[in-house]
Interface confidence: low
């Protein structure tokens, strides 16, 4: 048998695993699709992105609302031509998430 | 130009993005490679897994030490033949991480 305390622990864990905005490490260059001779330092920033579990396999955790936050980063050109400069970089930050059906696939795709 | 306070903020953020064990949502069934007629409730658990950024593209964030933690979950068989039972499930929990070189690829792979 299982007691109420055990069920509470399981339920709390389940709540924590569910689809919600989570702090995630994002690589700036791939996020912005920058040219290969420009890179950023630090290469990664922390933003909130939708993640976690959905109750059904047919659903995926997707963002329903997004804000853009500005991060100060060094933009460096290769070969190094000037003192690295601080530039504001706008990165998507998920503010709302929902378990939504995966996009229907074409039967022949 | 940039002042020291700005650099401190960037430095703090960089520390937080670096390769380290992070609380992650893991799908138990795929983790355990269970047969399709057995599933767990909740389907996901929170464990620590290596994640974050490495300074160089040639390095990836990998686990250097692992412990196994026990999670109490309901194991359900389909079709439902008995009352769902609470079972202890051992899930890998990364306790140490390091930026390590990616495995060398075969030239023809």
């Amino acid at each position: 048998f299982y007691d109420i305390e055990t069920l509470k622990v399981i339920d709390e864990e389940w709540q924590r695993t569910q689809c919600s905005p989570r702090e995630t490490c994002v690589e700036v260059a791939s996020e912005l699709g920058k040219s290969t001779n420009t890179f950023f330092k630090p290469p990664c920033v922390n933003v909130f992105r939708c993640g976690g579990c959905c109750n059904e396999e047919s659903l995926i955790c997707m963002n329903t609302s997004t804000s853009y936050i500005s991060k100060q980063l060094f933009e460096i050109s290769v070969p190094l031509t000037s003192v690295p400069e601080l530039v504001p970089v706008k990165v998507a930050n998920h503010t709302g998430c929902k378990c939504l059906p995966t996009a229907p696939r074409h039967p022949y795709s | 130009f940039y002042d020291i306070e700005t650099l401190k903020v960037i430095d703090e953020e960089w520390q937080r993005t670096q390769c380290s064990p992070r609380e992650t949502c893991v799908e138990v069934a795929s983790e355990l490679g269970k047969s399709t007629n057995t599933f767990f409730k909740p389907p996901c658990v929170n464990v620590f897994r290596c994640g974050g950024c490495c300074n160089e593209e040639s390095l990836i964030c990998m686990n250097t030490s692992t412990s196994y933690i026990s999670k109490q979950l309901f194991e359900i068989s389909v079709p439902l033949t008995s009352v769902p039972e609470l079972v202890p499930v051992k899930v890998a929990n990364h306790t140490g991480c390091k930026c390590l070189p990616t495995a060398p690829r075969h030239p023809y792979s």
Partner: antibody
Framework: QVTLKESGPALVKPTQTLTLTCTFS??????????VGWIRQPPGKALEWLAN???????YYNPVLQDRLTISKDTSKNQVVLTMTNMDPVDTATYYC?????????WGQGTLVTVSS | DIVMTQTPLSLPVTPGEPASISCRSS???????????LHWYLQKPGQSPQLLIY???NRFSGVPDRFSGSGSGTDFTLKISRVEAEDVGVYFC?????????FGGGTKVEIK
């Protein structure tokens, strides 16, 4: 508040190696993006950038002088050291330590190095 | 290397009168990121250089508004609208667009 102070010999002989130390406070060279560099100024002449070192130990040298220069850091002591080999009387100058930002905001007071036999 | 040429070499001025210093670079100082890294420093007698203007026209904090910078590409100007006695010293232009970072030869401003 940021301060930088240069120290080293006031007089060196031709062909000798000059070693200059920059001791700084108000910032740490372990902080992301931070750099410290050296600039010199011969008496009555223009400024010349020599070298700099970054928080991650990347180093950049003026190509004209790079064969003679070595820059290093001791983060725990808040110090940066510049060595310049094979000194010549034309290297007589005031040597400045700077915090490397774009542009240079914080400079040391400078130390005059005379090269003479 | 980028050569920075300043004119005039010496500039005798009368307090209250305007003054202008020119700086010309041997090639464009426009960086691939669109910024122009041309800066102006003042070195007062017996002191280290101090930043006046950064990126062509931005006054550094605490710099009086009688100082202004302008220009683009290869031609740049520092203007002092009304010279004061405390403005004497050597003015240097500097570029940090291209490595090695280089400085102009300096313009000595002195009171007539």
């Amino acid at each position: 508040q940021v301060t930088l102070k240069e120290s080293g010999p006031a007089l060196v002989k031709p062909t000798q190696t000059l070693t200059l130390t920059c001791t700084f406070s108000g910032f740490s060279l372990s902080t992301y993006g931070m750099g410290v560099g050296w600039i010199r100024q011969p008496p009555g002449k223009a400024l010349e950038w020599l070298a700099n070192i970054w928080w991650n130990d990347d180093k950049y040298y003026n190509p004209v002088l790079q064969d003679r220069l070595t820059i290093s850091k001791d983060t725990s002591k808040n110090q940066v050291v510049l060595t310049m080999t094979n000194m010549d009387p034309v290297d007589t100058a005031t040597y400045y330590c700077v915090q490397v930002t774009n542009p240079f905001v914080f400079w040391g007071q400078g130390t005059l190095v005379t090269v003479s036999s | 290397d980028i050569v920075m040429t300043q004119t005039p070499l010496s500039l005798p001025v009368t307090p209250g009168e305007p003054a202008s210093i020119s700086c010309r670079s041997s090639q464009s100082l426009v960086h691939i990121n669109g910024n122009t890294y041309l800066h102006w420093y003042l070195q007062k007698p017996g002191q280290s250089p101090q930043l006046l203007i950064y990126k062509v026209s931005n006054r550094f904090s605490g710099v009086p508004d009688r100082f202004s910078g302008s220009g683009s590409g290869t031609d740049f100007t520092l203007k002092i609208s009304r010279v004061e006695a405390e403005d004497v010293g050597v003015y240097f232009c500097s570029q940090s667009t291209h490595v090695p970072w280089t400085f102009g030869g300096g313009t000595k401003v002195e009171i007539k």
